[in-house]
């Protein structure tokens, strides 16, 4: 039932960019100015977001895809499709509700958004701190102690650093 | 529709005051934190203050301690900036702007604002 009736329906025959018109015998029209449709078989077409005040047009509305907003810099999006625009603080900071805060001894932050995060305990992994960490950058763990101790027979390279600060946003 | 209206803002003298507004309509104002954020010519914007849901709680941003009000009318969804001791450097276009679901609980997005007002000092 459901094919034949798709195959009856000529409301399906209209592409994206278009929407069937109830009031002109279901032909297809083109989507009115500041208006869209994503998909075909539409019987109406959906009204284009406005960037409006901080917001500002990434990409214009077009006939098949809606406009996409950013935020003016300052700010950074938020939310699904950039809802919100939240505030930028600087590295070594967070935002709270009483605005930028730099971060607390022991933690870091090396982006403009986000929380500041602990720094990383070199000893879980039985390593050295080779490279103190501050508010805008992790601590750099080196070899282990015993590595370092004299008379070793071998010292192994230090494993390259990880990447610090690229926790999932 | 969801909807803020900045007014009050105009031209004054260093040293002057004024008192910008913002009228809300369309959602229930008084469930929602709302922020000032301010843009200066040529410059990025910049959150000025906020003030929760009942107006216990208000924070500014250090250039405006002791200088600015942020307030709060809930019986008439409006919410207010006095600004006082206006300097050059608080000419800005001023937007009131709603503060998100999740305001104060784990992010600080604005997801409504308004069109600006705009305030020059100068003498």
């Known amino acids: 039932f459901e094919r034949t009736r798709s195959l009856q329906d000529p409301c399906s025959n209209c592409p994206a960019g278009t929407f069937c018109d109830n009031n002109r015998n279901q032909i297809c029209s083109p989507c009115p100015p500041n208006s869209f449709s994503s998909a075909g078989g539409q019987r109406t077409c959906d009204i284009c977001r406005q960037c409006k005040g901080v917001f500002r047009t990434r990409k214009e509305c077009s006939s098949t895809s809606n406009a996409e907003c950013d935020c003016t810099p300052g700010f950074h999006c938020l939310g699904a499709g950039c809802s919100m625009c939240e505030q930028d603080c600087k590295q070594g900071q967070e935002l709270t509700k009483k605005g930028c805060k730099d971060c607390c001894f022991g933690t870091f932050n090396d982006q403009k958004r986000g929380i500041c995060r602990p720094w990383t305990n070199c000893s879980l992994d039985g390593k050295s701190v080779l490279v103190n960490g501050t508010k805008e950058r992790d601590v750099v763990c080196g070899p282990s102690p015993a590595d370092l101790s004299p008379g070793a027979s071998s010292v192994t390279p230090p494993a390259p650093a990880r990447e610090p600060g690229h926790s999932p946003q | 529709e969801v909807q803020l209206v900045e007014s009050g803002g105009g031209l004054v003298q260093p040293g002057g005051s004024l008192r910008l507004s913002c009228a809300a309509s369309?959602?229930?104002?008084?469930?929602?934190?709302m922020s000032w954020v301010r843009q200066a010519p040529g410059r990025g914007l910049e959150w000025v203050a906020n003030?929760?849901?009942?107006?216990?709680?208000?924070y500014y941003v250090d250039s405006v301690k002791g200088r600015f009000t942020i307030s709060r009318d809930n019986a008439k969804s409006s919410l207010y900036l006095q600004m006082n001791s206006l300097r050059a450097e608080d000419t800005a276009v001023y937007y009131c702007?709603?503060?998100?679901?999740?305001?104060?609980?784990?992010?600080?997005?604005?997801?409504?604002w308004g069109q600006g007002t705009t305030v020059t000092v100068s003498s």
């Open positions: 702007a709603r503060g998100g679901e999740e305001y104060s609980s784990s992010h600080y997005g604005m997801d409504v």
């Open positions: 003030i929760n849901q009942d107006g216990s709680e208000k």
């Open positions: 369309g959602f229930t104002f008084s469930n929602y934190w």
